[in-house]
């Protein structure tokens, strides 16, 4: 606990103090005060330095002074033998003796008091940074003035901080401008702009005069703008040493003014002023800019659009331009979005074609769609090249955006038909031979395949049975052979309406307009097996010839057989219709006079005993097509026939072009178009 | 008259192969769908496989599946049969034969034997 | 595949006995059948077709029936030089059967 006085004496005194003892006193006074510690009497061995026996006299790590040997007072008023004053409220005393006295020593008397400290000239470091007044136990520190103590009490410092300015355009100066600023002083102006606005700051270098920087290039006084995350100084010395137009690229800044308690100068004065925030004219990749200017400012609204082949995509949703607008912290919105290449995407697939996949589907990329050659052509044109347009699609130079159509290739056969004798006086046959050849099996008949979705027959062939089960793509028609081909499911049956219904069949003598459509459920995959014959031009070009040869296929009654299992087929002449109606009816059902020939029907056969005949009804009469010797068109369809192995009767196809043209459009579907 | 004269056959070790051929004369050759058949001694027969008449479809039994290949030149009127990985069951005499139509065949060679031993 | 099943597998019988042997399919041939003669040493040789239909050039005395799984082969008077193996053959099937054959022998 500090005390304002007290003793201090050695062991044992007044009488002998011991040997080989080390005692220590520690002092304390209040706070504020020094010590003043005097002795009044000193009897302690006398030896160099004190070395052996001593009274040590300590501030924190100062010795202050050892003592030994005897002392008299020189004052004859004062008992004060020696005496010690610091500046402190702490002293520390140590007395210690040897381990002999070759005479006997009495020690020391001493005393100390709590002394006023004169803080303002008693230290090397001046307490106050201007005006020190002291009184007993403490100082206190005052200011010039205009001046005003700062919280740490010591340092005196100009009012000139707190000031905010708002207004777009103004004045700022260090105090007293243009007489020398206040030393000691931290000055901080604050300019709060609008956003969007940016501070400019303009100097010019006359108006600037801070105490130089030291040799280290340290400014002792010095001039900082701060704005946001940038700093703009420190600044010093005499002329503005910085840009004299300061774009700070923020609505906020704060101006921090340092000086120190020497050197100063006349200081500094500047003008700022508010700017719209300026964004930058960015370089947009593919884009133009409207309106187009040389700088752009705060609220400044412009256009990005993309060039042809580049869209902004924002989410799923792909536009061609986007408004940006130039904000107040100099950014532009929108800024994220880009133009980027057009997108294709996968192109869409097409049935009975393919397209590779691209490597690309991003604006001009190109890709090529193909049909399954040779099966399928495409029928729309446009050479099936599709390049990624501005636009997103894949459009093609002729089709535009429409996907191309495969339709199958008629009346190509993947095998020639190397005629010999069958049928009746006909040959064995592969269906690859006759790939449109299709089979009825009740009753039992064929039919040709003229599209994916229809099959040309007889009339006479479907009048009793409207859901016909019929094959495809197989040369044998045993059981097994056709659960292995392709069936095809009937949606519904057209008779020619000049076909006349008779309530006994069996009994009919006009076969005229013996033609009939069967509208598919799905669509026939076309191949090697399977594939449409082509129908008759409407030009005269198809109008047949007596001797012109046609094939003619089906699994009908043979020589040896009521009906064949393997596909049979044989070429045949056109004949003149008066030899069909000379040959005498086989089984006659009525008279031979009843018998119905019409222009509707051709005749052929007569060679070699090569007929068609029961069994073979509906089939194909394929006649080489005269504008394109490739391929095989249906110019005639198995009808009827006086004697098998004789003449026959075949419906003459190219004069119902027409209605089934008509017939197949009117019950065409979406899924075919 | 119609002939059928098959040759190429003989003793072969397992896992070889052989070469049977058929020359067809009498007949237009092109004409006519062409079989083999075989019959091991004192078995049956069994049908081996089928070629129509261009050459384009071929059937072959599953004993012989992957192993043997029936093939025909029309240029030269005749049929052969291609024999590989044999085995000891492929032992017996081997007919070429005509399909007059829808499989029932009409005329027969005389055979050729092919045995398969080691 | 479609087995063909020949009974009896041997018969023996007198010139001018009628003699019959059965085929039977393991499923529905339709008519899809043919009949074979093999004389010893010799190449089969074909007799009936389509079940029924007799090959040209083959004695009338031979004679076929059936249809579906159950077939007959008959020879109405038997002849010393019918001493044979007979064989049914179907083509119902992808790749046509025999039947196991069945040796006629004279008494």
């Known amino acids: 606990e500090p005390t304002m006085y007290g003793e201090i004496l050695s062991p044992n005194y007044p009488q002998a103090y011991p040997s080989e003892v080390e005692k220590s006193w520690d002092i304390e006074v209040p706070e504020g005060y020094g010590i003043h510690l005097y002795f009044t009497h000193l009897d302690i061995e006398l030896s160099e330095n004190c070395a052996y026996d001593s009274v040590q006299i300590i501030s924190g790590d100062t010795e202050e002074g050892r003592l030994c040997g005897q002392r008299s007072s020189n004052n004859p008023h004062s008992p004060i033998v020696e005496e010690f004053q610091v500046p402190y409220n702490k002293l520390q005393v140590i007395f210690k003796s040897d381990f002999s006295n070759e005479e006997r020593f009495t020690g020391f008397a001493a005393y100390y008091v709590a002394t006023d400290i004169n803080e303002c000239t008693d230290f090397v470091d001046v307490p106050c940074s201007h005006f020190c007044n002291n009184f007993i136990g403490g100082y206190f520190c005052s200011c010039p003035p205009e001046y005003f103590l700062h919280d740490d009490m010591k340092n005196c410092g100009v009012n000139c901080s707190g000031d905010v300015f708002t207004a777009l355009i103004g004045e700022i100066a260090s105090p007293n401008y243009p007489k020398p600023y206040p030393e000691n002083s931290r000055c901080e102006y604050q300019i709060r702009l609008e956003k969007g606005f940016q501070v400019v700051v303009t100097l010019r270098r006359e108006d600037f005069d801070v105490e130089a920087a030291d040799s280290a290039g340290n400014c002792l006084d010095s001039l900082v703008f701060v704005a946001g995350d940038r700093q703009f100084g420190p600044y010093c010395g005499h002329g503005f040493p910085g840009p004299l137009n300061i774009e700070t690229k923020s609505n906020a800044l704060d101006i921090i003014f340092q000086t120190d308690l020497t050197g100063q100068k006349k200081g500094w004065k500047l003008r700022y002023h508010g700017d719209p925030m300026p964004c930058p004219k960015e370089d947009t990749p593919n884009s133009v800019w409207e309106p187009a200017k040389a700088k752009y400012v705060f609220r400044d609204v412009v256009q990005i659009t993309c060039l042809d082949g580049f869209e902004v995509v924002e989410g799923r949703v792909g536009a061609t331009s986007f408004y940006s607008t130039c904000q107040s912290n100099g950014k532009w919105s929108n800024s994220k979005l880009k133009c980027q290449p057009v997108d294709c995407g996968i192109p869409e697939s097409i049935e009975n074609g393919k397209v590779e996949d691209p490597e690309s589907t991003l604006f001009g990329s190109v890709i090529r769609y193909t049909c399954e050659e040779p099966y399928y052509y495409m029928e729309n044109g446009g050479g099936g090249e599709y390049h990624c347009a501005g636009n997103g699609s894949w459009v093609n130079e002729v089709l535009g955006p429409e996907l191309p159509k495969c339709v199958p290739v008629c009346g190509v056969p993947r095998e020639p038909f190397e005629e010999k004798q069958r049928i009746i006086g006909g040959s064995d046959a592969d269906i690859k031979n006759f790939p449109w050849q299709v089979f009825f099996d009740n009753p039992w008949a064929g039919g040709a395949l003229i599209n994916e979705y229809w099959v040309l027959t007889a009339a006479h062939v479907v009048e009793g049975n409207r859901e016909p089960t019929m094959y495809v793509g197989s040369t044998s028609v045993q059981t097994s052979r056709l659960a292995k081909s392709k069936m095809l499911t009937p949606e519904h049956v057209f008779i020619h309406p000049g076909w006349k219904l008779l309530e006994v069949p069996e009994g009919r003598t006009n076969f005229d307009n013996d033609i009939a459509l069967v509208r598919l459920k799905d669509p026939v995959k076309m191949g090697p097996t399977v594939s449409p014959i082509c129908l008759p031009g409407t030009s005269s070009d198809y109008n047949l010839m007596d001797g012109d040869l046609g094939l003619i296929s089906g699994w009908g009654r043979t020589e040896k057989r009521d009906r064949a299992v393997r596909l049979k087929a044989a070429r045949l002449p056109v004949a003149p219709l008066r030899k069909c109606k000379e040959v005498k009816v086989e089984k006659p059902t009525a008279d031979a006079e009843a018998y119905v020939f019409t222009p509707n029907m051709i005749c052929a056969g007569g060679e070699k005993g090569m007929d068609s005949c029961k069994g073979d009804s509906g089939g194909a009469f394929a006649v080489q097509d005269p504008n394109d010797k490739t391929k095989f068109y249906a110019a005639g369809l198995v009808s009827w026939g006086p004697q098998c192995g004789t003449y026959g009767l075949y419906t003459r196809v190219k004069n119902y072009v027409d209605w089934i043209m008509k017939t197949m459009q009117e019950n065409s579907t979406p899924r075919e178009d | 008259q119609v002939q059928l004269v098959e040759s190429g056959g003989g003793l072969v070790k397992p896992g070889g192969s052989l070469r049977l051929s058929c020359a067809a004369s009498g007949f237009t050759f092109s004409d006519y769908y062409m079989s083999w058949i075989r019959q091991a001694p004192g078995k049956g027969l069994e049908w081996v496989s089928y070629i129509s008449r261009s050459g384009s479809t071929k059937y072959y039994a599953d004993s012989v599946k992957g192993r043997f290949t029936i093939s025909r030149d029309n240029a030269k009127n005749s049929l052969y049969l291609q024999m590989n990985s044999l085995r000891a069951e492929d032992t017996a005499v081997y007919y070429c034969?005509?399909?007059?139509?829808?499989?029932?065949?009409?005329?027969w060679g005389q055979g050729t034997l092919v045995t398969v031993s080691s | 595949d479609i087995q063909m099943t020949q009974s009896p597998s041997s018969l023996s019988a007198s010139v001018g006995d009628r003699v019959t042997i059965t085929c039977q399919a393991s499923q529905d041939i339709s008519n899809y059948l043919n009949w074979y003669q093999q004389k010893p040493g010799k190449a089969p040789k074909l007799l009936i077709y389509?079940?029924?239909n007799l090959e040209t050039g083959v004695p009338s005395r031979f004679s076929g029936s059936g249809s579906g799984t159950d077939f007959t082969f008959t020879i109405s008077s038997l002849q010393p030089e019918d001493i044979a193996t007979y064989y049914c053959q179907q083509y119902e099937d992808l790749i046509p059967t025999f039947g196991g054959g069945t040796k006629v022998e004279i008494k």
């Open positions: 389509d079940a029924s």
């Open positions: 034969a005509r399909d007059e139509s829808d499989y029932a065949l009409d005329f």
